[in-house]
Protein backbone atom coordinates (compact mmCIF):
# COMPACT_ATOMS: atom_id res chain seq x y z
CA UNK A 1 0.00 0.00 0.00
CA UNK A 2 0.84 3.69 0.31
CA UNK A 3 3.06 3.18 3.34
CA UNK A 4 5.25 0.75 1.44
CA UNK A 5 5.53 3.20 -1.45
CA UNK A 6 6.34 6.03 0.97
CA UNK A 7 8.99 3.87 2.55
CA UNK A 8 10.48 3.03 -0.87
CA UNK A 9 10.41 6.66 -1.96
CA UNK A 10 12.07 7.79 1.25
CA UNK A 11 14.78 5.23 0.69
CA UNK A 12 15.31 6.07 -2.99
CA UNK A 13 15.49 9.87 -2.64
CA UNK A 14 18.32 9.78 -0.10
CA UNK A 15 21.52 11.17 -1.57
CA UNK A 16 23.84 8.24 -1.07
CA UNK A 17 25.49 5.61 -3.25
CA UNK A 18 23.00 3.11 -4.66
CA UNK A 19 19.83 5.21 -4.77
CA UNK A 20 18.01 6.42 -7.93
CA UNK A 21 18.27 9.96 -6.66
CA UNK A 22 22.03 9.79 -6.13
CA UNK A 23 22.74 8.40 -9.61
CA UNK A 24 20.81 11.22 -11.30
CA UNK A 25 22.06 13.79 -8.84
CA UNK A 26 25.78 13.17 -9.43
CA UNK A 27 25.36 13.49 -13.20
CA UNK A 28 22.04 14.69 -14.52
CA UNK A 29 20.40 12.29 -16.95
CA UNK A 30 18.61 15.23 -18.54
CA UNK A 31 20.10 17.21 -21.40
CA UNK A 32 20.26 20.81 -20.31
CA UNK A 33 20.51 23.63 -22.84
CA UNK A 34 21.17 27.29 -22.31
CA UNK A 35 19.84 29.52 -25.06
CA UNK A 36 21.06 33.10 -25.35
CA UNK A 37 19.40 36.06 -27.01
CA UNK A 38 21.69 39.06 -27.42
CA UNK A 39 20.33 42.60 -27.43
CA UNK A 40 21.92 44.21 -30.48
CA UNK A 41 21.97 48.00 -30.09
CA UNK A 42 20.68 49.71 -33.24
CA UNK A 43 21.51 53.35 -32.47
CA UNK A 44 24.79 53.56 -30.52
CA UNK A 45 25.77 57.03 -31.77
CA UNK A 46 22.42 58.64 -31.01
CA UNK A 47 22.52 57.27 -27.48
CA UNK A 48 26.07 58.45 -26.86
CA UNK A 49 25.61 61.89 -28.40
CA UNK A 50 21.99 62.71 -27.53
CA UNK A 51 21.10 60.39 -24.65
CA UNK A 52 18.35 58.89 -26.84
CA UNK A 53 16.40 55.82 -25.88
CA UNK A 54 18.43 52.69 -26.61
CA UNK A 55 16.90 50.75 -29.50
CA UNK A 56 17.56 47.05 -29.14
CA UNK A 57 16.81 44.08 -31.34
CA UNK A 58 17.16 40.64 -29.82
CA UNK A 59 19.12 38.08 -31.83
CA UNK A 60 19.04 34.41 -31.00
CA UNK A 61 18.78 31.75 -29.90
CA UNK A 62 22.44 30.80 -29.62
CA UNK A 63 22.39 27.49 -27.83
CA UNK A 64 24.92 25.74 -25.60
CA UNK A 65 24.77 22.40 -23.90
CA UNK A 66 25.44 22.88 -20.18
CA UNK A 67 25.42 20.91 -16.93
CA UNK A 68 26.76 17.79 -18.65
CA UNK A 69 29.64 17.35 -16.19
CA UNK A 70 29.33 15.15 -13.12
CA UNK A 71 29.60 16.72 -9.70
CA UNK A 72 33.15 16.67 -8.35
CA UNK A 73 34.72 16.07 -4.94
CA UNK A 74 31.54 14.35 -3.73
CA UNK A 75 32.12 13.70 -0.02
CA UNK A 76 29.68 12.22 2.46
CA UNK A 77 29.80 13.34 6.09
CA UNK A 78 28.19 10.66 8.27
CA UNK A 79 28.31 12.84 11.36
CA UNK A 80 25.98 15.58 10.14
CA UNK A 81 24.32 13.61 7.31
CA UNK A 82 25.47 15.91 4.57
CA UNK A 83 27.15 15.49 1.23
CA UNK A 84 29.43 18.15 -0.21
CA UNK A 85 30.37 18.71 -3.84
CA UNK A 86 31.52 21.09 -6.55
CA UNK A 87 29.37 21.67 -9.62
CA UNK A 88 31.76 22.05 -12.59
CA UNK A 89 30.87 24.50 -15.34
CA UNK A 90 31.07 23.65 -19.00
CA UNK A 91 29.39 24.89 -22.17
CA UNK A 92 29.44 23.38 -25.66
CA UNK A 93 28.07 25.37 -28.57
CA UNK A 94 25.27 23.66 -30.50
CA UNK A 95 25.27 25.08 -34.07
CA UNK A 96 22.20 23.08 -35.13
CA UNK A 97 20.14 24.70 -32.35
CA UNK A 98 21.44 28.21 -33.05
CA UNK A 99 20.61 30.96 -35.54
CA UNK A 100 24.25 31.69 -36.27
CA UNK A 101 27.79 31.04 -35.10
CA UNK A 102 29.89 32.09 -32.13
CA UNK A 103 31.63 34.50 -34.52
CA UNK A 104 28.47 36.57 -35.07
CA UNK A 105 28.97 40.26 -34.22
CA UNK A 106 26.83 42.37 -31.90
CA UNK A 107 26.80 46.02 -30.92
CA UNK A 108 26.61 46.05 -27.14
CA UNK A 109 27.45 48.32 -24.25
CA UNK A 110 31.18 48.54 -23.57
CA UNK A 111 31.30 46.42 -20.42
CA UNK A 112 34.68 47.72 -19.26
CA UNK A 113 33.82 51.40 -19.74
CA UNK A 114 30.50 51.05 -17.91
CA UNK A 115 32.02 49.02 -15.07
CA UNK A 116 35.17 51.10 -14.58
CA UNK A 117 33.26 54.38 -14.52
CA UNK A 118 30.99 52.90 -11.84
CA UNK A 119 33.73 51.33 -9.71
CA UNK A 120 36.11 54.30 -9.85
CA UNK A 121 33.91 57.27 -9.00
CA UNK A 122 36.70 59.60 -7.93
CA UNK A 123 36.74 62.54 -10.35
CA UNK A 124 40.50 62.57 -10.84
CA UNK A 125 40.59 58.81 -11.41
CA UNK A 126 37.78 59.23 -13.95
CA UNK A 127 39.96 61.72 -15.84
CA UNK A 128 42.69 59.12 -15.90
CA UNK A 129 40.17 56.54 -17.13
CA UNK A 130 38.97 59.02 -19.75
CA UNK A 131 42.49 59.35 -21.09
CA UNK A 132 42.84 55.56 -21.31
CA UNK A 133 39.42 55.08 -22.90
CA UNK A 134 40.31 57.63 -25.56
CA UNK A 135 43.83 56.31 -26.04
CA UNK A 136 42.47 52.80 -26.60
CA UNK A 137 39.83 54.16 -29.03
CA UNK A 138 37.12 52.68 -26.83
CA UNK A 139 33.60 54.08 -26.74
CA UNK A 140 30.31 53.70 -24.89
CA UNK A 141 29.38 50.83 -27.20
CA UNK A 142 31.51 48.17 -28.84
CA UNK A 143 31.20 45.45 -31.44
CA UNK A 144 31.95 41.99 -30.08
CA UNK A 145 31.47 38.41 -31.23
CA UNK A 146 29.17 36.11 -29.30
CA UNK A 147 32.16 34.10 -28.09
CA UNK A 148 33.91 37.24 -26.83
CA UNK A 149 30.83 38.64 -25.14
CA UNK A 150 30.01 35.44 -23.27
CA UNK A 151 33.34 33.84 -22.57
CA UNK A 152 35.81 36.72 -22.54
CA UNK A 153 38.08 39.01 -24.54
CA UNK A 154 41.10 41.14 -23.77
CA UNK A 155 39.80 44.67 -23.37
CA UNK A 156 41.97 47.35 -25.01
CA UNK A 157 41.05 50.03 -22.47
CA UNK A 158 41.69 47.84 -19.42
CA UNK A 159 44.98 46.75 -20.96
CA UNK A 160 46.18 50.35 -20.55
CA UNK A 161 44.94 50.82 -16.98
CA UNK A 162 47.94 51.39 -14.70
CA UNK A 163 46.18 49.65 -11.81
CA UNK A 164 46.60 45.90 -11.42
CA UNK A 165 43.23 44.95 -12.97
CA UNK A 166 42.00 41.87 -14.83
CA UNK A 167 42.15 42.83 -18.49
CA UNK A 168 39.88 40.01 -19.70
CA UNK A 169 36.18 40.80 -19.74
CA UNK A 170 33.17 38.61 -20.51
CA UNK A 171 29.69 38.21 -19.08
CA UNK A 172 30.43 34.64 -18.01
CA UNK A 173 34.22 34.87 -17.81
CA UNK A 174 35.72 32.68 -16.45
CA UNK A 175 33.38 29.73 -17.11
CA UNK A 176 34.83 26.58 -18.69
CA UNK A 177 37.18 24.78 -16.28
CA UNK A 178 35.63 26.50 -13.27
CA UNK A 179 33.20 25.12 -10.69
CA UNK A 180 30.40 26.45 -8.52
CA UNK A 181 30.54 25.68 -4.81
CA UNK A 182 31.51 24.03 -2.54
CA UNK A 183 27.91 23.10 -1.76
CA UNK A 184 27.13 21.06 1.33
CA UNK A 185 23.60 19.63 1.29
CA UNK A 186 21.65 17.34 3.57
CA UNK A 187 21.61 13.78 2.26
CA UNK A 188 18.27 12.96 3.94
CA UNK A 189 19.50 9.88 5.79
CA UNK A 190 18.34 11.07 9.18
CA UNK A 191 15.48 13.29 8.03
CA UNK A 192 14.06 12.89 4.54
CA UNK A 193 12.28 16.25 4.75
CA UNK A 194 15.70 17.91 4.61
CA UNK A 195 17.08 16.04 1.60
CA UNK A 196 18.91 18.25 -0.93
CA UNK A 197 18.48 21.34 1.25
CA UNK A 198 21.66 23.37 1.28
CA UNK A 199 23.42 23.46 4.63
CA UNK A 200 26.32 25.67 3.54
CA UNK A 201 27.60 27.31 0.35
CA UNK A 202 31.31 28.07 0.15
CA UNK A 203 31.49 27.10 3.80
CA UNK A 204 28.88 29.61 4.99
CA UNK A 205 25.17 29.70 5.76
CA UNK A 206 24.83 33.20 4.42
CA UNK A 207 26.13 35.08 1.39
CA UNK A 208 27.52 38.36 2.77
CA UNK A 209 25.91 40.27 -0.14
CA UNK A 210 22.67 41.36 1.47
CA UNK A 211 21.31 42.54 4.81
CA UNK A 212 19.09 40.51 7.12
CA UNK A 213 17.05 37.54 5.81
CA UNK A 214 17.88 38.39 2.17
CA UNK A 215 21.38 37.09 2.82
CA UNK A 216 20.27 33.61 3.80
CA UNK A 217 20.89 30.49 1.71
CA UNK A 218 17.47 28.88 1.64
CA UNK A 219 16.21 25.59 0.26
CA UNK A 220 17.78 23.42 -2.41
CA UNK A 221 19.50 24.20 -5.72
CA UNK A 222 16.11 23.62 -7.48
CA UNK A 223 17.20 20.35 -9.14
CA UNK A 224 15.12 18.53 -6.54
CA UNK A 225 13.14 19.17 -3.38
CA UNK A 226 12.28 17.01 -0.39
CA UNK A 227 9.64 14.40 -1.38
CA UNK A 228 5.86 14.62 -1.00
CA UNK A 229 5.53 18.15 -2.30
CA UNK A 230 2.23 19.89 -1.53
CA UNK A 231 0.56 22.48 -3.76
CA UNK A 232 0.34 24.84 -0.81
CA UNK A 233 4.11 24.85 -0.31
CA UNK A 234 6.39 27.74 -1.11
CA UNK A 235 9.49 26.12 -2.57
CA UNK A 236 12.67 27.93 -1.60
CA UNK A 237 15.85 27.54 -3.63
CA UNK A 238 19.22 29.20 -4.02
CA UNK A 239 20.62 30.31 -7.36
CA UNK A 240 24.27 31.31 -7.49
CA UNK A 241 23.60 32.92 -10.91
CA UNK A 242 21.51 35.61 -9.25
CA UNK A 243 23.42 35.61 -5.95
CA UNK A 244 20.34 35.06 -3.85
CA UNK A 245 17.72 32.65 -2.62
CA UNK A 246 14.29 32.92 -4.21
CA UNK A 247 11.04 30.97 -4.16
CA UNK A 248 8.40 29.42 -6.39
CA UNK A 249 4.66 28.90 -5.84
CA UNK A 250 2.24 26.39 -7.32
CA UNK A 251 0.56 27.45 -10.55
CA UNK A 252 -1.01 24.41 -12.23
CA UNK A 253 -1.11 20.66 -12.75
CA UNK A 254 0.78 19.58 -15.86
CA UNK A 255 1.08 16.22 -17.56
CA UNK A 256 4.69 15.68 -18.59
CA UNK A 257 5.14 12.62 -20.80
CA UNK A 258 2.44 10.82 -18.87
CA UNK A 259 3.80 11.88 -15.47
CA UNK A 260 1.62 14.19 -13.36
CA UNK A 261 3.76 17.11 -12.21
CA UNK A 262 3.16 20.36 -10.36
CA UNK A 263 4.18 23.50 -12.16
CA UNK A 264 5.75 25.96 -9.74
CA UNK A 265 6.53 29.48 -10.97
CA UNK A 266 8.47 32.46 -9.68
CA UNK A 267 5.72 34.94 -8.83
CA UNK A 268 5.85 38.63 -9.72
CA UNK A 269 5.76 39.30 -5.95
CA UNK A 270 9.32 37.94 -5.70
CA UNK A 271 10.45 40.84 -7.90
CA UNK A 272 8.27 43.51 -6.31
CA UNK A 273 9.53 46.65 -4.61
CA UNK A 274 9.51 46.82 -0.80
CA UNK A 275 6.49 49.12 -1.13
CA UNK A 276 4.46 46.18 -2.46
CA UNK A 277 6.39 43.35 -0.78
CA UNK A 278 8.03 44.54 2.46
CA UNK A 279 10.10 41.31 2.63
CA UNK A 280 12.14 42.63 -0.28
CA UNK A 281 13.45 45.68 1.60
CA UNK A 282 16.88 44.10 2.00
CA UNK A 283 17.28 43.54 -1.74
CA UNK A 284 17.18 47.30 -2.21
CA UNK A 285 20.80 48.28 -1.69
CA UNK A 286 20.88 51.89 -2.88
CA UNK A 287 18.42 54.75 -3.17
CA UNK A 288 19.22 56.58 -6.42
CA UNK A 289 18.86 53.99 -9.18
CA UNK A 290 16.00 52.33 -7.29
CA UNK A 291 14.23 55.69 -6.93
CA UNK A 292 14.12 55.32 -3.17
CA UNK A 293 13.31 51.61 -3.42
CA UNK A 294 10.17 52.18 -5.49
CA UNK A 295 11.55 50.64 -8.71
CA UNK A 296 11.05 46.92 -9.07
CA UNK A 297 11.94 43.98 -11.27
CA UNK A 298 15.71 44.50 -11.29
CA UNK A 299 18.21 43.21 -8.76
CA UNK A 300 21.51 45.00 -8.16
CA UNK A 301 24.06 42.18 -7.73
CA UNK A 302 27.14 44.43 -7.91
CA UNK A 303 28.31 43.27 -4.47
CA UNK A 304 28.43 39.76 -5.83
CA UNK A 305 30.24 40.86 -9.00
CA UNK A 306 33.27 42.68 -7.51
CA UNK A 307 31.54 46.04 -7.75
CA UNK A 308 30.65 45.76 -11.43
CA UNK A 309 27.18 47.31 -11.88
CA UNK A 310 25.37 44.12 -12.93
CA UNK A 311 21.59 44.07 -12.62
CA UNK A 312 19.59 40.86 -13.00
CA UNK A 313 16.01 40.90 -14.22
CA UNK A 314 13.57 38.68 -16.02
CA UNK A 315 13.85 38.78 -19.83
CA UNK A 316 12.56 41.92 -21.52
CA UNK A 317 12.09 43.41 -18.03
CA UNK A 318 9.08 41.21 -17.33
CA UNK A 319 7.54 42.22 -13.96
CA UNK A 320 9.73 45.35 -13.86
CA UNK A 321 8.57 48.90 -13.20
CA UNK A 322 7.95 51.17 -16.21
CA UNK A 323 10.84 53.49 -15.29
CA UNK A 324 13.29 50.62 -15.82
CA UNK A 325 12.25 49.82 -19.38
CA UNK A 326 11.31 53.39 -20.38
CA UNK A 327 14.77 54.27 -21.82
CA UNK A 328 14.90 51.02 -23.83
CA UNK A 329 12.96 50.52 -27.08
CA UNK A 330 12.32 47.12 -28.62
CA UNK A 331 11.35 45.06 -25.57
CA UNK A 332 8.24 42.84 -25.55
CA UNK A 333 7.83 41.04 -22.23
CA UNK A 334 5.40 38.15 -22.00
CA UNK A 335 4.91 35.63 -19.23
CA UNK A 336 4.83 32.52 -21.39
CA UNK A 337 8.27 33.11 -22.88
CA UNK A 338 10.00 35.00 -20.12
CA UNK A 339 9.01 33.63 -16.73
CA UNK A 340 10.81 30.87 -14.84
CA UNK A 341 9.03 27.64 -13.97
CA UNK A 342 9.84 24.26 -12.40
CA UNK A 343 7.82 21.12 -13.13
CA UNK A 344 8.14 18.98 -10.02
CA UNK A 345 7.05 15.39 -9.61
CA UNK A 346 5.42 15.72 -6.18
CA UNK A 347 6.08 12.24 -4.79
CA UNK A 348 9.85 12.26 -5.27
CA UNK A 349 10.33 16.03 -5.31
CA UNK A 350 12.42 15.70 -8.49
CA UNK A 351 12.38 18.58 -10.97
CA UNK A 352 11.60 16.77 -14.23
CA UNK A 353 11.37 19.86 -16.42
CA UNK A 354 12.37 23.45 -15.92
CA UNK A 355 12.91 26.73 -17.71
CA UNK A 356 15.14 29.19 -15.93
CA UNK A 357 14.98 32.60 -17.59
CA UNK A 358 16.97 35.63 -16.65
CA UNK A 359 18.40 38.77 -18.20
CA UNK A 360 21.82 40.29 -17.61
CA UNK A 361 21.89 44.09 -17.59
CA UNK A 362 24.59 46.64 -16.90
CA UNK A 363 24.13 50.07 -15.40
CA UNK A 364 25.74 52.98 -17.22
CA UNK A 365 25.68 56.47 -15.76
CA UNK A 366 26.58 59.91 -17.06
CA UNK A 367 30.12 60.99 -16.20
CA UNK A 368 31.34 64.55 -16.49
CA UNK A 369 34.94 63.36 -16.70
CA UNK A 370 34.55 60.54 -19.23
CA UNK A 371 33.90 61.98 -22.64
CA UNK A 372 32.11 58.97 -24.11
CA UNK A 373 29.59 59.13 -21.22
CA UNK A 374 29.47 62.89 -20.92
CA UNK A 375 26.40 63.56 -23.05
CA UNK A 376 24.21 61.10 -21.17
CA UNK A 377 21.37 62.85 -19.36
CA UNK A 378 20.15 59.84 -17.39
CA UNK A 379 21.07 56.46 -16.00
CA UNK A 380 20.43 53.42 -18.15
CA UNK A 381 20.05 49.82 -17.04
CA UNK A 382 21.16 48.37 -20.37
CA UNK A 383 20.00 44.86 -21.34
CA UNK A 384 22.93 42.85 -22.70
CA UNK A 385 21.35 39.42 -23.12
CA UNK A 386 18.74 37.10 -21.79
CA UNK A 387 18.99 33.36 -21.36
CA UNK A 388 16.68 30.41 -21.20
CA UNK A 389 18.13 27.37 -19.48
CA UNK A 390 15.92 24.35 -20.01
CA UNK A 391 15.91 20.67 -19.21
CA UNK A 392 13.27 18.00 -19.76
CA UNK A 393 13.33 14.39 -18.68
CA UNK A 394 14.11 12.11 -21.65
CA UNK A 395 11.49 9.69 -23.02
CA UNK A 396 13.35 6.62 -21.79
CA UNK A 397 13.80 8.06 -18.31
CA UNK A 398 10.14 9.14 -18.29
CA UNK A 399 9.02 5.58 -19.09
CA UNK A 400 11.20 4.25 -16.30
CA UNK A 401 9.91 6.90 -13.92
CA UNK A 402 6.29 6.11 -14.81
CA UNK A 403 6.74 2.40 -14.25
CA UNK A 404 8.77 2.70 -11.06
CA UNK A 405 7.07 5.62 -9.34
CA UNK A 406 3.83 7.08 -10.62
CA UNK A 407 2.56 3.82 -12.15
CA UNK A 408 2.84 2.05 -8.82
CA UNK A 409 0.84 4.72 -7.06
CA UNK A 410 -1.89 5.06 -9.65
Amino acid sequence: GDLLIQKTIKKQVVLEEGTIAFKNWVKTGTEVYRQFWIFDVQNPQEVMMNSSNIQVKQRGPYTYRVRFLAKENVTQDAEDNTVSFLQPNGAIFEPSLSVGTEADNFTVLNLAVAAASHIYQNQFVQMILNSLINKSKSSMFQVRTLRELLWGYRDPFLSLVPYPVTTTVGLFYPYNNTADGVYKVFNGKDNISKVAIIDTYKGKRNLSYWESHCDMINGTDAASFPPFVEKSQVLQFFSSDICRSIYAVFESDVNLKGIPVYRFVLPSKAFASPVENPDNYCFCTEKIISKNCTSYGVLDISKCKEGRPVYISLPHFLYASPDVSEPIDGLNPNEEEHRTYLDIEPITGFTLQFAKRLQVNLLVKPSEKIQVLKNLKRNYIVPILWLNETGTIGDEKANMFRSQVTGKIN
Epitope: I128, L132, Q371, K374
Partner: antibody, heavy 116, light 107 residues
Protein backbone atom coordinates in the same frame (compact mmCIF):
# COMPACT_ATOMS: atom_id res chain seq x y z
CA UNK B 1 56.09 62.00 -27.70
CA UNK B 2 53.84 64.29 -25.64
CA UNK B 3 55.05 67.90 -25.76
CA UNK B 4 53.66 71.02 -24.13
CA UNK B 5 55.07 74.32 -25.28
CA UNK B 6 54.71 77.23 -22.88
CA UNK B 7 56.37 80.64 -23.29
CA UNK B 8 59.29 80.94 -20.88
CA UNK B 9 58.44 84.35 -19.39
CA UNK B 10 55.77 87.02 -19.35
CA UNK B 11 56.27 90.46 -17.82
CA UNK B 12 53.10 92.48 -17.13
CA UNK B 13 52.06 95.53 -15.14
CA UNK B 14 49.85 95.40 -12.03
CA UNK B 15 46.14 95.69 -12.82
CA UNK B 16 46.61 94.32 -16.34
CA UNK B 17 45.57 90.91 -17.73
CA UNK B 18 47.63 88.21 -19.38
CA UNK B 19 46.75 85.17 -21.47
CA UNK B 20 49.17 82.29 -20.98
CA UNK B 21 49.31 79.65 -23.70
CA UNK B 22 50.09 75.95 -23.74
CA UNK B 23 50.44 74.33 -27.16
CA UNK B 24 50.05 70.56 -27.10
CA UNK B 25 51.43 68.03 -29.54
CA UNK B 26 52.11 64.30 -29.69
CA UNK B 27 48.64 63.27 -28.55
CA UNK B 28 44.95 63.88 -29.32
CA UNK B 29 44.38 67.24 -27.68
CA UNK B 30 40.61 66.85 -27.20
CA UNK B 31 40.94 63.47 -25.47
CA UNK B 32 42.57 64.64 -22.26
CA UNK B 33 41.56 67.10 -19.57
CA UNK B 34 44.07 69.93 -19.15
CA UNK B 35 45.03 71.17 -15.70
CA UNK B 36 46.78 74.35 -14.63
CA UNK B 37 49.00 74.59 -11.56
CA UNK B 38 50.64 77.63 -9.90
CA UNK B 39 54.00 77.63 -8.13
CA UNK B 40 55.28 80.72 -6.39
CA UNK B 41 59.07 81.09 -6.02
CA UNK B 42 60.34 78.81 -3.29
CA UNK B 43 56.78 77.73 -2.45
CA UNK B 44 54.48 74.79 -2.99
CA UNK B 45 52.06 73.96 -5.78
CA UNK B 46 48.47 75.18 -6.10
CA UNK B 47 45.86 73.63 -8.35
CA UNK B 48 44.01 76.31 -10.34
CA UNK B 49 41.51 74.34 -12.38
CA UNK B 50 40.84 72.00 -15.27
CA UNK B 51 39.24 72.13 -18.71
CA UNK B 52 37.92 69.44 -21.03
CA UNK B 53 39.14 70.50 -24.51
CA UNK B 54 36.40 68.49 -26.22
CA UNK B 55 33.63 70.81 -25.01
CA UNK B 56 35.37 73.48 -22.89
CA UNK B 57 33.78 72.27 -19.66
CA UNK B 58 35.69 73.73 -16.69
CA UNK B 59 36.12 73.23 -12.95
CA UNK B 60 37.95 75.81 -10.85
CA UNK B 61 39.53 75.97 -7.46
CA UNK B 62 37.22 78.44 -5.70
CA UNK B 63 40.26 80.52 -4.77
CA UNK B 64 40.99 81.25 -8.46
CA UNK B 65 37.42 81.90 -9.61
CA UNK B 66 37.31 85.40 -11.08
CA UNK B 67 41.09 85.44 -11.32
CA UNK B 68 41.66 82.67 -13.88
CA UNK B 69 39.68 81.81 -17.02
CA UNK B 70 40.49 78.61 -18.88
CA UNK B 71 39.82 78.26 -22.61
CA UNK B 72 41.00 76.13 -25.53
CA UNK B 73 41.45 76.48 -29.26
CA UNK B 74 40.89 73.02 -30.70
CA UNK B 75 42.09 73.98 -34.17
CA UNK B 76 45.58 74.79 -32.90
CA UNK B 77 45.57 72.28 -29.98
CA UNK B 78 46.27 75.12 -27.57
CA UNK B 79 45.02 75.67 -24.04
CA UNK B 80 44.90 79.16 -22.57
CA UNK B 81 44.65 80.62 -19.10
CA UNK B 82 43.74 84.27 -18.77
CA UNK B 83 44.69 85.93 -15.48
CA UNK B 84 43.04 89.26 -14.71
CA UNK B 85 43.60 92.18 -12.31
CA UNK B 86 47.16 91.12 -11.74
CA UNK B 87 49.04 91.86 -8.54
CA UNK B 88 52.46 90.86 -7.27
CA UNK B 89 50.74 87.86 -5.63
CA UNK B 90 50.20 86.47 -9.12
CA UNK B 91 53.92 86.40 -9.85
CA UNK B 92 54.66 82.68 -10.17
CA UNK B 93 55.44 79.85 -12.53
CA UNK B 94 52.30 78.48 -14.20
CA UNK B 95 52.27 74.90 -15.48
CA UNK B 96 49.82 73.22 -17.83
CA UNK B 97 49.44 69.45 -17.53
CA UNK B 98 47.16 67.11 -19.48
CA UNK B 99 45.73 64.26 -17.45
CA UNK B 100 47.02 61.07 -18.91
CA UNK B 101 47.15 58.78 -16.06
CA UNK B 102 48.18 61.49 -13.66
CA UNK B 103 49.98 64.80 -13.91
CA UNK B 104 53.03 63.10 -15.38
CA UNK B 105 53.40 65.25 -18.50
CA UNK B 106 53.88 68.81 -17.35
CA UNK B 107 54.78 71.79 -19.49
CA UNK B 108 58.04 73.55 -18.65
CA UNK B 109 56.02 76.38 -17.15
CA UNK B 110 55.69 80.10 -17.84
CA UNK B 111 57.27 82.46 -15.35
CA UNK B 112 54.90 85.39 -14.90
CA UNK B 113 56.33 88.54 -13.36
CA UNK B 114 53.95 91.29 -12.30
CA UNK B 115 55.88 94.50 -11.86
CA UNK B 116 55.51 98.17 -12.62
CA UNK C 1 39.89 72.41 1.64
CA UNK C 2 41.98 69.37 2.55
CA UNK C 3 45.34 70.39 3.96
CA UNK C 4 48.35 68.14 3.32
CA UNK C 5 51.17 68.62 5.80
CA UNK C 6 54.72 67.57 5.00
CA UNK C 7 56.20 68.29 8.40
CA UNK C 8 59.83 68.01 7.34
CA UNK C 9 60.77 70.83 4.99
CA UNK C 10 64.31 69.48 4.58
CA UNK C 11 65.80 66.03 4.89
CA UNK C 12 69.45 65.16 4.66
CA UNK C 13 70.63 61.73 3.56
CA UNK C 14 73.61 59.96 2.03
CA UNK C 15 73.92 57.96 -1.18
CA UNK C 16 72.86 54.35 -0.52
CA UNK C 17 70.70 55.29 2.48
CA UNK C 18 66.96 54.79 2.89
CA UNK C 19 64.78 57.83 3.53
CA UNK C 20 61.05 58.26 4.22
CA UNK C 21 59.10 61.40 3.33
CA UNK C 22 55.79 61.73 5.15
CA UNK C 23 52.54 63.48 4.32
CA UNK C 24 49.52 63.90 6.61
CA UNK C 25 46.05 64.80 5.36
CA UNK C 26 43.63 66.88 7.44
CA UNK C 27 40.86 64.39 6.61
CA UNK C 28 40.45 60.92 5.14
CA UNK C 29 41.46 60.84 1.47
CA UNK C 30 41.40 57.07 1.02
CA UNK C 31 44.28 56.15 -1.28
CA UNK C 32 43.73 59.09 -3.60
CA UNK C 33 47.24 60.44 -3.20
CA UNK C 34 50.06 61.03 -5.69
CA UNK C 35 53.73 61.87 -5.17
CA UNK C 36 55.80 64.19 -7.39
CA UNK C 37 59.50 64.86 -7.72
CA UNK C 38 60.72 68.32 -8.73
CA UNK C 39 64.38 68.76 -9.49
CA UNK C 40 65.88 72.29 -9.34
CA UNK C 41 64.82 74.36 -12.39
CA UNK C 42 62.52 71.63 -13.76
CA UNK C 43 58.79 70.97 -13.82
CA UNK C 44 57.39 68.31 -11.46
CA UNK C 45 57.42 64.66 -12.47
CA UNK C 46 54.87 62.12 -11.22
CA UNK C 47 56.29 59.15 -9.30
CA UNK C 48 53.39 57.45 -7.51
CA UNK C 49 49.60 57.35 -7.93
CA UNK C 50 46.89 55.86 -5.72
CA UNK C 51 49.24 56.04 -2.75
CA UNK C 52 51.32 53.00 -3.70
CA UNK C 53 51.48 52.44 -7.46
CA UNK C 54 54.57 53.49 -9.39
CA UNK C 55 54.28 55.16 -12.78
CA UNK C 56 56.00 53.28 -15.57
CA UNK C 57 59.64 54.20 -15.84
CA UNK C 58 59.96 55.14 -12.17
CA UNK C 59 62.79 53.20 -10.48
CA UNK C 60 61.59 50.61 -7.99
CA UNK C 61 63.60 52.22 -5.21
CA UNK C 62 60.62 54.62 -4.92
CA UNK C 63 57.81 53.11 -2.86
CA UNK C 64 54.54 54.71 -1.72
CA UNK C 65 52.42 53.53 1.17
CA UNK C 66 49.57 54.60 3.41
CA UNK C 67 45.83 55.25 3.29
CA UNK C 68 43.33 57.46 5.05
CA UNK C 69 45.36 60.34 6.47
CA UNK C 70 48.97 59.14 6.67
CA UNK C 71 51.17 58.60 3.63
CA UNK C 72 54.83 57.85 3.10
CA UNK C 73 57.18 57.98 0.15
CA UNK C 74 60.22 55.79 0.79
CA UNK C 75 63.39 56.02 -1.27
CA UNK C 76 65.67 53.08 -0.65
CA UNK C 77 69.27 53.09 -1.85
CA UNK C 78 69.23 56.87 -2.43
CA UNK C 79 71.11 58.03 -5.54
CA UNK C 80 72.65 61.44 -6.17
CA UNK C 81 70.04 62.10 -8.90
CA UNK C 82 67.32 61.88 -6.24
CA UNK C 83 68.33 65.36 -5.03
CA UNK C 84 64.97 67.10 -5.44
CA UNK C 85 61.87 68.40 -3.72
CA UNK C 86 59.06 65.90 -3.17
CA UNK C 87 55.39 66.88 -3.06
CA UNK C 88 52.33 64.86 -2.15
CA UNK C 89 48.96 65.65 -3.73
CA UNK C 90 45.43 64.56 -2.83
CA UNK C 91 42.80 64.11 -5.51
CA UNK C 92 40.08 62.80 -3.25
CA UNK C 93 38.04 65.98 -3.46
CA UNK C 94 38.03 69.44 -5.01
CA UNK C 95 40.08 71.51 -4.91
CA UNK C 96 43.03 69.19 -5.42
CA UNK C 97 45.72 70.22 -2.98
CA UNK C 98 49.46 69.67 -2.62
CA UNK C 99 51.70 69.31 0.39
CA UNK C 100 54.24 72.06 1.07
CA UNK C 101 57.11 69.89 -0.17
CA UNK C 102 60.14 68.19 1.36
CA UNK C 103 63.59 69.00 0.00
CA UNK C 104 65.98 66.08 -0.06
CA UNK C 105 69.63 67.03 0.34
CA UNK C 106 72.45 64.60 -0.36
CA UNK C 107 75.31 64.82 2.14
Amino acid sequence: QVQLQQPGTELVKPGASVKLSCKASGYTFTSYWMHWVKQRPGQGLEWIGEIDPSDSHTNYNQKFKGKATLTVDKSSSTAYMQLSSLTSEDSAVYYCAPIYYGLDNWGQGTTLTVSS
Amino acid sequence: DIVLTQSQKFMSTSVGDRVSVTCKASQNVGTNVAWYQQKPGQSPKALIYSASYRYSGVPDRFTGSGSGTDFTLTISNVQSEDLAEYFCQQYNSYPYTFGGGTKLEIK
